[in-house]
Every structure is written in structure tokens, then in C-alpha cells.
Interface confidence: low
């Protein structure tokens, strides 16, 4: 109807069987799947193909980043006639097949999610028996990983004219808002969010000039939670110390 999918209805033994002759290859994936860091996510992928009742060897592949060229994160192979797809590659052991490729299902489970897993994934199937054919999703499924804030670095650095500045870097999704508090800063000084180039989940806030000794606290917050870390400035010792 919308494009060139062809669907027919066959009647066998008076039982309605919805059978697609699958005149072409296609893959069905959702645009996006969301999950929290630390949890697991399912990346659904089902497909149709033009080779009815294909029972030969097949390989199921998932890759990340970009179709056709991105690095493989999972690969399994099923022998002729076998419904068992033996895992040959599972990056960091965190990827496992949920679907049955013999039943046109390549759905994948990703365990112990990290923010670095937030990217697009592409499923692929290869037939290698009497039939040699392969197909890969072009658009893929975007895995959106959310995470409560975590402060990954907080430090005091020297700056010109014997002054000091403080840097706080946090990660999270949605990217956290950062605020500094400390001597003469009032309760909370909101810092402009500045996701670092190429590090979409990292945000850095700077206090350009620390004018008083004492404890400076960086707070990172997003809709999933908050995190705090502090540094201590003791200029009369000619040094600074950090504590998290």
C-alpha cells in the first residue's frame, strides 16, 4: 500500500493463515529505544525476505554507528537446519540474541548499559547456503541511554596573576545542569552548560577566579538525580587539595 510490500491471504484447511510471500527484503526496526544506564535494553529487529522456507546456513550481525561500515558488536551463526545461532562475537559479553533468526527475528538484548552505548545500531542477516543473499537495515534503531549525573572530574588549577580557577566536569543524560557554591558565591551559582565537542554527555562548568579560601562544591542535576563533589582551596599553604 504505502510502498512495494506485497501481502496476501491464503486459506488452508479453512484456517486463515496470514502469509506474506515477501517479494523483497525488508527490515522492521523502531526509530528509538530508551533505557537507563545500568539497565538492559531490547533492540527489536524483524525482517522479511524473498527466499521462502530458507533453511540453509545464516549469520546474524549487529553493528553500531553506521550501516555497512560500522564496527560489529554482535555476530552469531546458525548451521543448516539449526535454530540455534551460535554466538561468535558479543562485544564485552553484553550483547545476546533474543530473537530467532529462523523465524525472521534478530532482536538483540544489550546488558549493563553505559552512556557510551547511546548510538544507532543496525541489524543484518546473511544467507550462505544454496541461496547467497544478505540484507541490512539502513536507518537502524537509535538506542537512547539516560543516566543520572556523575561528576567525573573536579579540580583547582592555577591561572594567571597567581589566581586559581576551578573546573567541574559531569556526565549524564539529559546533560546535567551544573552549579557551584562556595565562599562569597552565595547558595548556588548556576553555570552555563557547555557540552564538550564530541562528548555529548559531558558538561563542564568553570569558576574563573577563586577569591576566598574554603570549600567549593559543584552540584550536577538532571531529571534523574543529582551528584555533588567538593574541592578545598588553601592559598596560605601555597597549594590546593581536592576531596570527592
Amino acid at each position: 500500500f504505502v510502498r512495494t510490500k506485497i501481502d496476501t491471504t491464503e486459506n488452508l484447511l479453512n484456517t486463515e493463515v496470514h502469509s506474506s510471500p515477501a517479494q523483497r527484503w525488508s527490515m522492521q526496526v523502531p526509530p528509538e529505544v530508551s533505557a537507563e544506564a545500568g539497565d538492559a535494553a531490547v533492540l527489536p529487529c524483524t525482517f522479511t525476505h524473498p527466499h521462502r522456507h530458507y533453511d540453509g546456513p545464516l549469520t546474524a550481525i549487529w553493528r553500531a554507528g553506521e550501516p555497512y561500515a560500522g564496527p560489529q558488536v554482535f555476530r552469531c551463526a546458525a548451521a543448516r537446519g539449526s535454530e540455534l545461532c551460535q554466538t561468535a562475537l558479543s562485544l564485552h559479553g553484553r550483547f545476546r540474541l533474543l530473537g530467532n533468526p529462523r523465524r525472521n527475528d534478530l532482536s538483540l538484548r544489550v546488558e549493563r548499559l553505559a552512556l557510551a552505548d547511546d548510538r544507532r545500531y543496525f541489524c543484518r542477516v546473511e544467507f550462505a547456503g544454496d541461496v547467497h543473499d544478505r540484507y541490512e537495515s539502513r536507518h537502524g534503531v537509535r538506542l537512547h541511554v539516560t543516566a543520572a549525573p556523575r561528576i567525573v572530574n573536579i579540580s583547582v588549577l592555577p591561572s594567571p596573576a597567581h589566581a586559581f580557577r576551578a573546573l567541574c566536569t559531569a556526565e549524564g543524560e539529559p546533560p546535567p545542569a551544573l552549579a557551584w557554591s562556595g565562599p562569597a558565591l552565595g547558595n548556588s551559582l548556576a553555570a552555563v552548560r557547555s557540552p564538550r565537542e564530541g562528548h555529548g554527555h559531558l558538561v563542564t562548568a568553570e569558576l574563573p577566579a577563586l577569591t576566598h579560601d574554603g570549600r567549593y562544591t559543584c552540584t550536577a542535576a538532571n531529571s534523574l538525580g543529582r551528584s555533588e563533589a567538593s574541592v578545598y582551596l588553601f592559598r596560605f599553604h601555597g597549594a590546593s587539595g581536592a576531596s570527592t
Partner: antibody
Framework: QVQLKQSGAELVRPGTSVQMSCKAV????????IGWVKQRPGHGLEWVGD????????NNNEKFRGKATLTADTSSSTAYMQLRGLTSDDSAIYYC???????????????WGQGTSVTVSS | QIVLSQSPALLSASPGEKVTMTCRAS?????MYWYQQKPGSSPKPWIY???NLTSGVPARFSGSGSGTSYSLTISRVEAEDAATYFC?????????FGGGSKLEIR
């Protein structure tokens, strides 16, 4: 040809639950997603969620979490949506639609049911 | 969530006129999708992936746009085009629809 046949209109009391059905005919039920859409006069269309009967996987609109539960019975090629804790805000027409999440990103709800009208009234 | 704002909410045209309705997204989307709905009927898919007409849609319809601004244009309106047109995005969950543009034929 592809058809989605929805159950009939419902008149229900506030605080109760209702379950509506969507029977798929003319295609392989387990190969496509079924989406549910709410339409209230003056409120346009609202996506409630969708379900893939082949892998029993659901996407939900957070707004309807706790309100709508999506299920599917592959043996009868029927999708179901249950709404609970009904209020007047739930009075609407609810459509099911086949969702074609295709390989090239050309997603579309390509076939729609005729809609189930739900009226919540005491 | 991505909010889709359609304008105008109501437009009136005479047969043969050119009509354009717009859909603005609160943040950038990759594609826009359009559905046609007539009173008492279910929505019908009309345009997918911004500019592709679904099967059976007359060639006088076209879709265009990118980023946050998209439009549906009818080059020469006919009486059968009277309907409400909804835009929709699949870019980010929850998938959302615009409020609709109702086209009346004078």
C-alpha cells in the same frame, strides 16, 4: 486486503476499566507493529503506544503509563488495549493502526482501524 | 517531547487555488509525515518521509521542508481535498502529531 477491525463503542462509568480489541486480517500479524492513537475533539491525535506481536515488545507514551496496557494474541491476530481508572478525559475515539517501521526510516501508520469510541459517564 | 504546531488551523480555498499549510517542530526532526482525515473516518497516510506520496494520493499534493519547518502544498485544490491534515514526527519518543489544519472548499 489488509484490514484492522476494532471492537464496538463503549459507554463506561468513571473509575472502571475498558478493554478494546483490534483484529488484523490480510497480512502477517507478527511482522508488524500495532500502534494505538487517541483522538479527542479539539485535541488532535495522540500516540498512546505500540506493540510488536512477534516479539511482544512495547513502546509507551509516558503520559499513558499506568493508564494504558497493550497486549497481543498471535493465535487470533488480535491486539488489545486496556484503559483503567477511567475519567472524562479518557472519553475519545481510539484507533489502532499498523505501523510500518521500514528499513529506510520511512515509518508510517499505513492501515488504520475504524476506531473504538469510549464514553466515560456516570 | 517534540511539539508540532500547524498553521493555519483553518483555511478556506476555492477549487483551482494553490494551498500551503505548515508544520513547525519545537526541535529539529529528520522527516515529517502527513495524514488526511475526513469527518467520520479514520486518518489516512498521505505523505511519508517529508516528500513521498503514499499510493493513491494525487500528484497535486507535495511535501517539503527540513529541520523545524515543513509544509504540505496542494497545487490546485479540488473539492475532494476538503479534510483535516495532521503532521507527525517519528524522530523522538513520544511520537507526536500536530493539532491539524482543516481545509474547507468554498
Amino acid at each position: 486486503q489488509v484490514q484492522l477491525k476494532q471492537s464496538g463503542a463503549e459507554l463506561v462509568r468513571p473509575g472502571t476499566s475498558v478493554q478494546m480489541s483490534c483484529k488484523a486480517v490480510g497480512y502477517t500479524f507478527t511482522n508488524y507493529w500495532i500502534g494505538w492513537v487517541k483522538q479527542r475533539p479539539g485535541h488532535g491525535l495522540e500516540w498512546v503506544g505500540d506493540i510488536h506481536p512477534g516479539i511482544n515488545y512495547t513502546n509507551n507514551n509516558e503520559k499513558f503509563r499506568g493508564k494504558a496496557t497493550l497486549t497481543a494474541d498471535t493465535s487470533s491476530s488480535t491486539a488489545y488495549m486496556q484503559l483503567r481508572g477511567l475519567t472524562s478525559d479518557d472519553s475519545a475515539i481510539y484507533y489502532c493502526a499498523r505501523v510500518d517501521y521500514d528499513y529506510d526510516g520511512s515509518y508510517i501508520m499505513d492501515y488504520w482501524g475504524q476506531g473504538t469510541s469510549v464514553t466515560v459517564s456516570s | 517531547q517534540i511539539v508540532l504546531s500547524q498553521s493555519p488551523a483553518l483555511l478556506s480555498a476555492s477549487p483551482g487555488e494553490k494551498v500551503t499549510m505548515t508544520c513547525r517542530a519545537s526541535s529539529s526532526v529528520s522527516y515529517m509525515y502527513w495524514y488526511q482525515q475526513k469527518p467520520g473516518s479514520s486518518p489516512k497516510p498521505w505523505i511519508y518521509a517529508t516528500s513521498n506520496l503514499t499510493s493513491g494520493v494525487p500528484a497535486r499534493f507535495s511535501g517539503s521542508g527540513s529541520g523545524t519547518s515543513y509544509s504540505l502544498t496542494i497545487s490546485r485544490v479540488e473539492a475532494e481535498d476538503a479534510a483535516t491534515y495532521f503532521c507527525q514526527q517519528w524522530n523522538s519518543k513520544p511520537w507526536t502529531f500536530g493539532g491539524g489544519s482543516k481545509l474547507e472548499i468554498r
